[in-house]
């Protein structure tokens, strides 16, 4: 998956740091104090639609087959720059009962971006 | 996640059957002959951006915090109707060496759609 470098406007991964204090979560998230969540941005021209980061998922490959053949309704589907690979991260926080929990939270960090 | 019922144009899951014969894959996929891949379509107005089916992923919850506050650069990010939950499926196929393989292939079936 492409890293955004300011030179291209094609779908890429942009670095972004989330501060839990900024969003008011620091009173229940013990650690970390923030993290690099990242996000996806950029254009998805038709020739790269269905390219999910470095590798295609089976589903997007199949749908792209139909899309590239102008098969209705896929020809008109908007292709979007979205996370295609997310990574978990370990967090220490208070749960709803104020117990301290250490848990690997799924889908916290965007690793790769691609065109849906 | 919403199922498309023809009544709403909000992001929803559309039923779609893929025939491997149609896309010319029947010469290497032994079974099944096709499957319900489904796909996502529909609008993502700002008030539902970041709502991934029935529950938010941690990443989209965080980004939505910033987006809904009009925080640059998220305010201008295009929100898209994309798969938020995919399911694997078992397939029987020939590999490159013409060996018969039975494998659970990840991300084959769209289970839920949501706004990125």
């Amino acid at each position: 998956g492409l890293e955004c470098d300011g030179k291209v406007n094609i779908c890429c991964k942009k670095q972004f740091f989330v501060s839990f204090k900024d969003i008011g979560w620091n009173d229940w998230i013990i650690a970390p104090s923030g993290y690099h969540a990242n996000y996806c941005e950029g254009e998805c021209p038709s020739h790269i639609a269905g390219t999910s980061g470095s590798s295609l998922s089976f589903h997007s490959t199949v749908i792209n087959h139909y899309r590239m053949r102008g098969h209705s309704p896929f020809a008109n589907l908007k292709s979007c720059c979205v996370p295609t690979k997310l990574r978990p991260m370990s967090m220490l926080y208070y749960d709803d009962g104020q117990n301290i929990i250490k848990k690997d939270i799924q889908n916290m960090i965007v690793e790769e971006c691609g065109c849906s | 996640g919403l199922e498309c019922d023809g009544k709403v144009n909000i992001c929803c899951k559309k039923q779609f059957f893929v025939s491997f014969k149609d896309i010319g894959w029947n010469d290497w996929i032994i079974a099944p002959s096709g499957y319900h891949a489904n796909y996502c379509e529909g609008e993502c107005p700002s008030h539902i951006a970041g709502t991934s089916g029935s529950s938010l992923s941690f990443h989209s919850t965080v980004i939505n915090h910033y987006r809904m506050r009009g925080h640059s650069p998220f305010a201008n990010l295009k929100s898209c109707c994309v798969p938020t939950k995919l399911r694997p499926m078992s397939m029987l196929y020939y590999d490159d060496g013409q060996n018969i393989i039975k494998k659970d292939i990840q991300n084959m079936i769209v289970e839920e759609c949501g706004c990125s």
């Epitope: 008011g24 009173d27 | 915090h65 987006r67 809904m68 506050r69």
Partner: antibody
Framework: QVQLVQSGAEVKKPGASVKVSCKAS????????MHWVRQAPGQGLEWMGS????????IYAQKFQGRVTMTRDTSISTAYMELSRLRSDDTAVYYC????????????????WGQGTLVTVSS | EIVLTQSPGTLSLSPGERATLSCRAS???????LAWYQQKPGQAPRLLIY???SRATGIPDRFSGSGSGTDFTLTISRLEPEDFAVYYC?????????FGGGTKVEIK
Amino acid sequence: QVQLVQSGAEVKKPGASVKVSCKASGYTFHGYNMHWVRQAPGQGLEWMGSINPYSGYTIYAQKFQGRVTMTRDTSISTAYMELSRLRSDDTAVYYCARARDIAAAGLGAFDYWGQGTLVTVSS
Amino acid sequence: EIVLTQSPGTLSLSPGERATLSCRASQSVRSSYLAWYQQKPGQAPRLLIYGASSRATGIPDRFSGSGSGTDFTLTISRLEPEDFAVYYCQQYVSYPRTFGGGTKVEIK
């Protein structure tokens, strides 16, 4: 300690509007969503909707769509629920309740509630 | 939406007895995002159980929650005089958030 203090009882005529406030203290106001739940006399609990105080993002129950407006003033840690076009069957106790709606972390129960505001709709 | 059905509507028991309250969901409540609340007359509801089985802060251990999927249970092992109240289950996995109709535990 966490406290949610609601405004006092109201008596309204049919067709009028009511605005109930919920002042939060003892925690970071914008870090938790605020939900509104009502309870008609002798009846069960009915969820009306919620607001994310950080972003202002709201989700309303379909039943109240178009009649309810949830807002907040982060400078005074207060959430508001306004219900318009009141009918007699809107007579109920209205509660605010806080929650962290983060399913990925297993969070979302209503851990603190306001004391309730009785709204009576009568001609 | 997920519809929650509580049974029985009323439970008449004596102090010291065991109370078993049921909550059934119209569809699976994924990852046990289910809570139980206690409400006494003239008071706001109070969180008892979250995540189907975890006790909230300050809740005595005579209260326990169990279940997954579509069937959930709140058990009060030995009823104390202060436990006579109405109990509600609630799901928080999807919008709209929904509550069960409640079970009233009254003194026999």
